[in-house]
């Protein structure tokens, strides 16, 4: 399946409609800043094989359709932005699975690689965390919006494995 | 390999305009906001004001607000810091220094050289 | 604004020493302090940042602390490359700010 140019192609399309969803400047919400700890280490010191890639990847983009498919960040976000960037996530993550089961067979069940996945929904689970904490400011989601762009452009080794023959 | 190339030193005479610029290159010009920061002669370091590169947003020091434009050009990767008509107090180093934005990372880890200006008649 | 207040303005001392400066803040700035080295001619160099994490590259010997309002600088055996000018700053808020700086002279 040629997932690298397609996902690049939706990543980069998904960035630019997470760019353009700001309401308010940032630079009123300096003291919001949080750290939110996405592991780059563990993945940057981690060779991942095209199944494990993809896997992670889906769960990232899975977990960010979730955090953007909320009440709370209905009430955030400028609507038709924010449809048309859970349109491209949606999208994402059926390439994804389509990948999938291109790469591994029906039959088969990818290597579910759990450490990443759980350092993932961790990662997640902190973000949601502090949206809880800071009562859904208007400065929390701009906090968390550019996180989520910084961890979308993060994720080079993955993308990496996605290029890779298993 | 991450750089911050600002433009050469510049005389001027008092009442001249000017530009600076300060060119991005080796990562993502858009994804880090850009400040500039003044050091007058044998003097210490001020923050003059800062700009998101992304949508040319910018937040200026109450000390600079009216004196100084900060802009950008995000398909050249540049920053620009211009005066309408300098003073002899503007005489100074400036230095710009890319800075994370909203994300938890180091603050102005990378800084370009450095532009002097004189203004004198 | 923030007022960012070092101490000591300069001081002396010899290699091997242990040196520290302090930074005090007019407010609440929580840990978000960083550190600069600055040499004469040059570019600031960014040491310390969040109050505590060490810059990549930077020598170990090097260590930040502090939060809310009192942080402190340590070289805890200065080197010759050492001796130069140290910047904290405020990121906590706009305006950014920074202290007046501490010279680090060979006594």
């Known amino acids: 399946c040629d997932l690298p140019q397609t996902h690049s192609l939706r990543n980069r399309r998904a960035l630019i409609l997470l760019a353009q969803m700001g309401r308010i400047s940032p630079f009123s919400c300096l003291k919001d800043r949080h750290e939110f700890r996405f592991p780059e280490e563990e993945f940057d010191g981690h060779q991942f094989q095209k199944t494990q890639a993809i896997s992670v990847l889906h769960e990232m983009i899975q977990q960010t359709f979730n955090l953007f498919s909320t009440e709370d960040s209905s009430a955030a976000w400028e609507q038709s932005l924010l449809e048309k960037f859970s349109t491209e996530l949606y999208q994402q993550l059926n390439d994804l699975e389509a990948c999938v089961i291109q790469e591994v067979g029906v039959e088969e069940t990818p290597l579910m690689n759990e450490d990443f996945i759980l350092a993932v929904r961790k990662y997640f689970q902190r973000i949601t965390l502090y949206l809880m904490e800071k009562k859904y400011s208007p400065c929390a989601w701009e906090v968390v919006r550019a996180e989520i762009m910084r961890s979308f452009s993060f994720s080079t080794n993955l993308k990496k494995g996605l290029r890779r023959k298993d | 390999e991450v750089q911050l190339v600002q433009s050469g030193a510049e005389v001027k005479k008092p009442g001249e305009s000017l530009k600076i610029s300060c060119k991005g290159s080796?990562?993502?010009?858009?994804?880090?906001?850009i400040g500039w920061v003044r050091q007058m002669p044998g003097k210490g370091l001020e923050w003059m004001g800062i700009?998101?590169?992304?949508?040319?947003?910018?937040a200026y020091s109450p000390s600079f607000q009216g004196q100084v434009t900060i802009s950008a050009d995000k398909s050249i990767s540049t920053a620009y810091l211009q005066w309408s008509s300098l003073k002899a107090s503007d005489t100074a180093m400036y230095y710009c220094?890319?800075?994370?934005?909203?994300?938890?990372?180091?603050?102005?880890?990378?800084w370009g050289q450095g532009t002097l200006v004189t203004v004198s008649s | 604004d923030i007022q960012m207040t070092q101490s000591p303005s300069s001081l002396s001392a010899s290699v091997g020493d242990r040196v520290t400066i302090t930074c005090r803040a007019s407010?609440?700035?929580?840990?978000?302090l960083n550190w600069y080295q600055q040499k004469p001619g040059k570019a600031p160099k960014l040491l310390i940042y969040?109050?505590?994490s060490l810059q990549s590259g930077v020598p170990s010997r090097f260590s930040g602390s502090g939060s809310g309002t009192d942080f402190t600088l340590t070289i805890s055996s200065l080197q010759p490359e050492d001796f130069a000018t140290y910047y904290c700053?405020?990121?906590?808020?706009?305006?950014?700010?920074f202290g007046q700086g501490t010279k680090v002279e060979i006594k």
């Open positions: 220094a890319r800075h994370p934005g909203l994300n938890w990372a180091p603050d102005f880890d990378y």
């Open positions: 080796g990562y993502s010009f858009t994804s880090y906001w």
């Open positions: 700009i998101d590169p992304s949508d040319s947003d910018t």
């Open positions: 407010q609440s700035i929580d840990r978000a």
């Open positions: 969040f109050a505590s």
């Open positions: 700053q405020q990121s906590f808020d706009f305006p950014l700010t």
